[in-house]
């Protein structure tokens, strides 16, 4: 005869475990139903009655099958230097990531705890390593024959234009100035940019009213064991 399917709650056979989506209740000494993601246990099972589950209340969630008495609280609203890439729902916590132009200086299990503005390389310095979602920009001095005349977190050092006759020689922060109207070779006008990390925004987000002013977090951050690279600015 085929074995009968046991309905929760039931006493497990000695040495056996409860089935998937069930848990062993020590008090009742029975296998009982877990609650689904988005729910929590309102009433624990007894020998004669199964777990009673309730829906997670506003701004709380459970991501897994569970028998917790209360759902977990969603994290606080994203700060002004962040974007909400995943909204708080019954089944998932809110995730905040840094907005463009910022990077995550202190991460957490999901998302970012503390964002900081990407370093800007001052004139005479260009971007050696672009910023990412989790790392700051690294600046380097412009090598001879190259320059950067901007304060930017994306501009690299560009070659000086080559003149037939040089009026003013170029330096690390200024392009060469030619006497003739047309140089032999020049770079395309405009600064050369490196791509910035882009935060992806999920389709379902909850609007977060931003405060009109938010203090900069950059002063809170240690810049590592050594002082910041020369040629960087804090803002």
């Amino acid at each position: 005869l085929p074995a009968q399917v046991a309905f929760t709650p039931y006493a497990p056979e000695p040495g056996s475990t409860c089935r998937l989506r069930e848990y062993y209740d020590q008090t009742a000494q029975m296998c009982c139903s877990k609650c689904s993601p988005g729910q929590h246990a309102k009433v624990f099972c007894t020998k004669t009655s199964d777990t009673v589950c309730d829906s997670c209340e506003d701004s709380t969630y459970t991501q897994l099958w569970n028998w917790v008495p209360e759902c977990l609280s969603c994290g606080s609203r994203c700060s002004s230097d962040q974007v909400e890439t995943q909204a708080c729902t019954r089944e998932q916590n809110r995730i905040c990531t840094c907005r463009p132009g910022w990077y995550c200086a202190l991460s957490k299990q999901e998302g970012c705890r503390l964002c900081a503005p990407l370093r800007k390389c001052r004139p005479g310095f260009g971007v050696a390593r672009p910023g990412t979602e989790t790392s700051d920009v690294v600046c380097k001095p412009c090598a001879p024959g190259t320059f950067s005349n901007t304060t930017s977190s994306t501009d690299i050092c560009r070659p000086h234009q080559i003149c037939n006759v040089v009026a003013i020689p170029g330096n690390a922060s200024m392009d060469a100035v030619c006497t003739s109207t047309s140089p032999t070779r020049s770079m395309a006008p405009g600064a050369v940019h490196l791509p910035q990390p882009v935060s992806t925004r999920s389709q379902h987000t909850q609007p977060t009213p931003e405060p009109s002013t938010a203090p900069s977090t950059s002063f809170l951050l240690p810049m590592g064991p050594s002082p910041p690279a020369e040629g960087s600015t804090g803002d």
Partner: antibody
């Protein structure tokens, strides 16, 4: 377009049962929880319960436990609510409504009028 | 369960007039949600997370409040705003609705 189409009006006798349906169109049925709400005689609204189609689990308002049973048929993207042991107190318009995983009913069905009369 | 009390139950306003209706909760709630319902129609989502307007809701509507006291305001009444408005919470199970404020046009 995101819509919830409910079954037509029902006239039932006291003590009988009725099963009303709510068919979802143009969205992934299992991604949205389905709630049922009662509105008696144009008055206020009462939440009956919720079903999570992805998991088949339910939560009920204590007041409607034993009165309402919520089920889903994923193959037809349809949610059902069965009402048992009907009395005149159960005469109302019943709505299905999705909540998108949040705590707010963002799409409502067309409503089903249930009249209990001998 | 949390009881939501809406006031006034019935009000009328002239076109262009500012309208404010309130929703008071018996216990503190995290957010309030609002719906508009017209006769022989299903409720429509109107305001969510206390102050965010649902899609298609005119900018003359606004929502505010915290704790146990919330309100819906229309900056300048229009004829199409005549309807019944319900508040709703889900900070505690079961979710509950207010008894509604019926807004008429003068």
């Amino acid at each position: 377009e995101f819509q919830l189409q409910q079954s037509g009006p029902e006239l039932v006798k006291p003590g009988a049962s009725v099963k009303i349906s709510c068919k979802a169109s143009s969205y992934s049925f299992t991604d949205y929880n389905m709630n049922w709400v009662k509105q008696s005689n144009g008055k206020s609204l009462e939440w009956i319960g919720i079903i999570f189609p992805k998991y088949g689990t339910t939560s009920y308002n204590q007041k409607f436990k034993g009165k309402a049973t919520l089920t889903v048929d994923q193959s037809s993207s349809t949610a059902y609510m069965q009402l048992n042991s009907l009395t005149s107190e159960d005469s109302a318009v019943y709505y299905c409504a999705t909540d998108g995983g949040t705590w707010y009913f963002d799409v409502w069905g067309t409503g089903t009028t249930v009249t209990v009369s001998s | 369960q949390i009881v939501l009390t809406q006031s006034p139950a019935l009000m009328s306003a002239s076109p262009g007039e500012k309208v404010t209706m309130t929703c008071s909760a018996s216990s503190s709630v995290t957010y309030m949600y609002w719906y508009q319902q017209k006769p022989r129609s299903s409720p429509k989502p109107w305001i969510y997370l206390t102050s965010n307007l649902a899609s298609g809701v005119p900018a003359r509507f606004s929502g505010s409040g915290s704790g146990t006291s919330y309100s819906l305001t229309i900056s300048s009444m229009e004829a199409e705003d005549a309807a019944t408005y319900y508040c709703q919470q889900w900070s505690s199970n079961p979710p509950t609705f207010g008894s509604g404020t019926k807004l008429e046009i003068k």
